[in-house]
């Protein structure tokens, strides 16, 4: 288990316990309960109060991080008396031993890399392990391929993201023969950590007066539909003076992605490239390969 649990309770205890795997806080059911509530307080004095489970003797915390340490609290009233109990959930282990600078990104629609750094006070023999649980907590994913630095796990590569949901809980545990290692945990939204591929199938067709650019939305890990995309087109006249402004055009995603612009013959050689982003986040992909149109003697 990754942390010590210490109970602060009056004589007649509710026997409060917390399962970090399921994020479930439970206690002994009391007869003739008239009121019960559970909540946690974190180090910044933020209070999270989830809904009670149907049996009213447990509650599940959905989106919480525990690495800074939290205090759980349960209040129960019965027709006879009131109960109150606190459960301290510290992040035991030496300060500064937990993994730090943790980050993940999804790329190529179905691959993910997570990286972290060794804690500054972690001993030489420290080893870190990554576990991922989706928001439904139905499944725990253990890192299948670790990235190592001098034998220490400092990253993880996943090539199967089927167990993820839109929001996921990441836990980096640590072990050492010398001292206790603190854990690090984080909640990440897949939509915020995905790096899109550039748009595909970019084509340019011109007639005497206009050019029409068409493209396909990139394949993404998240299920996004066409209105969820924003595109930027860089239409660039070749052989222009250095420092000449590129024409950047913003286009909203649509069922048919196209941009029609006036360009009369004879036209100079141009290139066009496109990048994509989630319309809500504008985390731009890299640019697509430049497509050339027009002629050198235009």
């Amino acid at each position: 288990e990754k942390s010590d649990l210490r109970t602060v309770a009056p004589a007649s205890s509710l026997n409060v316990r917390f399962d970090s795997r399921t994020m479930n806080l439970s206690w002994d059911c009391q007869e003739n309960t008239t009121f019960s509530k559970c909540f946690l307080t974190d180090k910044k004095n933020r209070v999270v109060e989830p809904r009670l489970s149907n049996n009213e003797c447990s509650c599940t915390f959905r989106e919480i991080c525990l690495h800074e340490g939290v205090t759980f609290e349960v209040h129960v009233n019965t027709s006879q008396r009131g109960f109150q109990q606190k459960l301290l959930y510290p992040n035991s282990g030496r300060e500064g031993t937990a993994a730090q600078n943790f980050s993940c990104f999804i790329y190529n629609a179905d691959l993910m890399n997570c990286t972290w750094a060794r804690g500054p006070t972690a001993p030489r023999d420290v080893q870190y392990f990554l576990y991922i649980r989706n928001s439904k907590r139905r499944r725990e994913i253990r890192c299948p391929y670790y990235i190592q630095d001098s034998g220490t796990h400092v990253g993880c590569h996943l090539d199967n993201l089927s167990g993820l949901t839109s929001r996921n809980y990441f836990l980096v545990n640590g072990t050492s023969r010398e001292i206790g290692i603190q854990f690090f945990d984080s909640l990440l939204d897949t939509k915020k950590i995905e790096r899109f591929n550039p748009p595909s199938n970019v084509t340019v067709r011109c007639n005497t007066t206009h050019c029409l650019v068409r493209w396909k939305q990139p394949r993404t890990y998240q299920k996004l539909s066409y209105l969820d995309f924003q595109y930027q087109l860089d239409v660039h006249r070749k052989n222009t003076q250095p420092g000449t402004e590129n024409l950047l055009i913003n286009v909203s995603g649509d069922l048919e992605n196209r941009y029609n612009f006036p360009s009369s013959e004879p036209r100079a050689k141009h290139s066009v490239k496109i990048r994509a982003a989630d319309v809500r986040i504008l985390n731009w992909s890299s640019w697509s390969e430049a497509i050339e149109f027009g002629s050198d003697d235009g």
Epitope: T165, S166, Q222, K223, L224, S225, Y226, L227, D228, L255, E256, V279, R280
Partner: antibody, heavy 120, light 111 residues
Amino acid sequence: QVQLVQSGAEVKKPGASVKVSCKISGHSLSELFIHWVRQTPTKGFEWMGGFDPEENEIVYAQRFQGRVTMTEDTSIDTAYLTLSSLRSDDTAVYYCSTVGSFSGPALHLWGKGTMVTVSS
Amino acid sequence: QAVLTQPSSVSGAPGQRVTISCTGSGSNIGAPYDVSWYQQLPGTAPKLLIYHNNKRPSGVPDRFSASKSGTSASLAITGLQADDEADYYCQSYDSQWNQPLFGGGTKVTVL
């Protein structure tokens, strides 16, 4: 020009089933996500179901669970809604629509609607 | 009973600005889930006017704008025109119902 062309009006008896079709033209159904919504004068718009990206499958509104089935034949770019054990309060206009964004979801393009009347 | 509450009707003279409110709760608009707005002209299918709370699909004039704050959202129509006379519906996802829900609709009358 993308269009959603729905099948014609239906009159059904209570207890019967109805199957409404929605033919996509101008685009491939395999690249689209279809939801179904119905409209009645008393209840207004009711979402019936559609593709849920989180579950990666078609999900149905609780109140239609067990009575509704949504299927697709991508070879002919047609989506279908089947509603069984019809009751008089199922009399409504049934619409298919494309999901422009899963956030909401935003139902972007709509068919013209299919009037289903349930009457003995 | 619609979970998203809209006024049953609003009216305005041509050229005026009208707004339609859509009041929800902490399990839908305030959750926060995105709001969409639809226009339904008499005898026709709905048309998407707004998605992602304030974005317009191509072809929707910029006379239509929307915003969201807390547990409510609003749609504004500026420079009201005769062909804006229609029913307008808001829609969002609701985590208690686990499904998208629509408002009861607002009839806009151009005087």
